[in-house]
Amino acid sequence: KIDACKRGDVTVKPSHVILLGSTVNITCSLKPRQGCFHYSRRNKLILYKFDRRINFHHGHSLNSQVTGLPLGTTLFVCKLACINSDEIQICGAEIFVGVAPEQPQNLSCIQKGEQGTVACTWERGRDTHLYTEYTLQLSGPKNLTWQKQCKDIYCDYLDFGINLTPESPESNFTAKVTAVNSLGSSSSLPSTFTFLDIVRPLPPWDIRIKFQKASVSRCTLYWRDEGLVLLNRLRYRPSNSRLWNMVNVTKAKGRHDLLDLKPFTEYEFQISSKLHLYKGSWSDWSESLRAQTPEEEPTGMLDVWYMKRHIDYSRQQISLFWKNLSVSEARGKILHYQVTLQELTGGKAMTQNITGHTSWTTVIPRTGNWAVAVSAANSKGSSLPTRINIMNLCEAGLLAPRQVSANSEGMDNILVTWQPPRKDPSAVQEYVVEWRELHPGGDTQVPLNWLRSRPYNVSALISENIKSYICYEIRVYALSGDQGGCSSILGNSKHKAPLSGPHINAITEEKGSILISWNSIPVQEQMGCLLHYRIYWKERDSNSQPQLCEIPYRVSQNSHPINSLQPRVTYVLWMTALTAAGESSHGNEREFCLQGKAN
């Protein structure tokens, strides 16, 4: 009931709480002497459902049969209407429409850790729309029954707040949840379990790793666990990997030896625990331990290449280059590289440690047979040295690879192809493809790149350190014992017309012809490999088409003679450069008048 209901009553039959689809009878009756003054026959009782008028009747009472009420709460209010006055509220009632609880499903209980508390969850089924009380009951040994009631409005979880102990780990407990409301009750199917079934251990903690004698092959993982743990599973992986290695261990007692770790690798380790071989559940994984394994001496050998440069009649410059070992080969931080240079006949040797570089340049006599050995060292030792005999890599003409070509292959790749040398192709032990940015000055400081190719290959895709719109000098070496032959070509991965033409810096007269000198186009404006230069000229103030001379591009060339100019005629000259993609805009214009006699 609502309100004070001083003037009358509202009664609801059969009950204020009804099953969905049921009919209710609502009666509103006035108390004695509470009708309209002097006009009791004029009493008009009106029944409202919320704010909507659903029935009225003249007299002291009103009966109304109501059907089709929705789930939830519906408010009915009875009011009295007298002539010439506002409606007066008499009384009201709330009717609660709902359903009996469905049987709770999927009851399951868990205790997190040996010191945790038992908590159970279940599925309530459809909403009853009524106050429904849930009671969780646990029957156990010694004829005891524990229970707890749920105070929440939507209850599908209850924590007993107390702990199951392992004093009789195989004893059976039976859980059941019962839902009760005004329209009925329903109990779940019983769920029977033992301590070992429902206790989910806490994840292991305090994980540590020890490497005996700083060796990766003598590694022990330590951790702490709850007292009853019987099984552990360990998982570990390099920090940069997505795949775990998994190990199951029984009765580990908080330690396990790991035998297959890689040196100088950061690993992530996690551990999980379980109380029984086939009962219960695994704990969550522990927090990760991250640890780096110790170094081991390097394996593998350095890939070494070299370049020789003539200095004068008695000296030559040797530049050695080598590639870093892979992480798995380095097995630690490379502290230095050891380079040993030896004259093979005299036996004189020079050793040097190189740090921070993967190249070394020295000057040696042009006479004698020279060899180098290069190895990489970390804190645990050195790699096996790579030995190379220094020879003239391009001396054997018959070993030179034939028909070398270089073609763009997608973004920032160049496909280099060749034919085996004329001399017995089976003599080739390996090919080396070398490339470096083309610098007109032949700068030896430009980084050198190379890759090795098996003797049966006749192509190589070069992609390392290849930039768009840069021209590369590419060499293919065929190596056979102490001999080598080579061929070279220019190539680029992407090209377009040069951004500018050459800058003419001087025009000089020589025996009736002229010599034009120019500055090279800056490398960053060449936009690929130059194929030709063009020199244009025409008479000043003439509208005729210019004449031109096309010169094949050569790296070192920066002058060219022209002998077809008339004496005492002023000419305008300019130059352009061409790549395979097209011609540049023209460079600066220069005027020149040949002073010599007419032919």
Partner: nanobody, 125 residues
């Protein structure tokens, strides 16, 4: 100083009801497990009912449905409602209190640290 004082005992006809009270001073009932035990003449003390600090209750199956333990935190008291009494329910009823957090411990005498003096319940046929 912790004190537990039982009251509400007395003589009652078989089939009758009693409500025993246990008033606690020196400790807060909601922080502890509260138990009721009874001892009949010439017999060992036996477990009747208990309520943990988390409001989980426990009863022996033999008495379930006839007894209810409850707690009033505001009054710092615990109650035991006894219904459908039988002559074999005749005993001294003791209120007890202890920091118990295990299922099995709630029904064990030795887990309770504090005890009242007891109140006599006599059921005649």
């Amino acid at each position: 100083q912790v004190q537990l004082q039982e009251s509400g005992g007395g003589s009652v006809q078989a089939g009758g009801s009693l409500r025993l009270s246990c008033a606690v001073s020196g400790r807060t009932v909601s922080d502890y497990a509260m138990g009721w035990f009874r001892q009949a003449p010439g017999k060992e003390r036996e477990f009747v009912a208990a309520m943990s600090s988390s409001e989980t209750t426990v009863y022996p199956n033999s008495m379930k449905g006839r007894i209810t333990i409850s707690r009033d935190n505001a009054k710092n008291a615990v109650y035991l409602q006894l219904n459908a009494l039988k002559p074999e329910d005749t005993a001294v009823y003791y209120c007890s209190m202890g920091p118990i957090a295990t299922f099995q411990g709630l029904a064990r005498q030795n887990e309770y640290h504090y005890w009242g003096q007891g109140t006599q319940v006599t059921v005649s046929s």
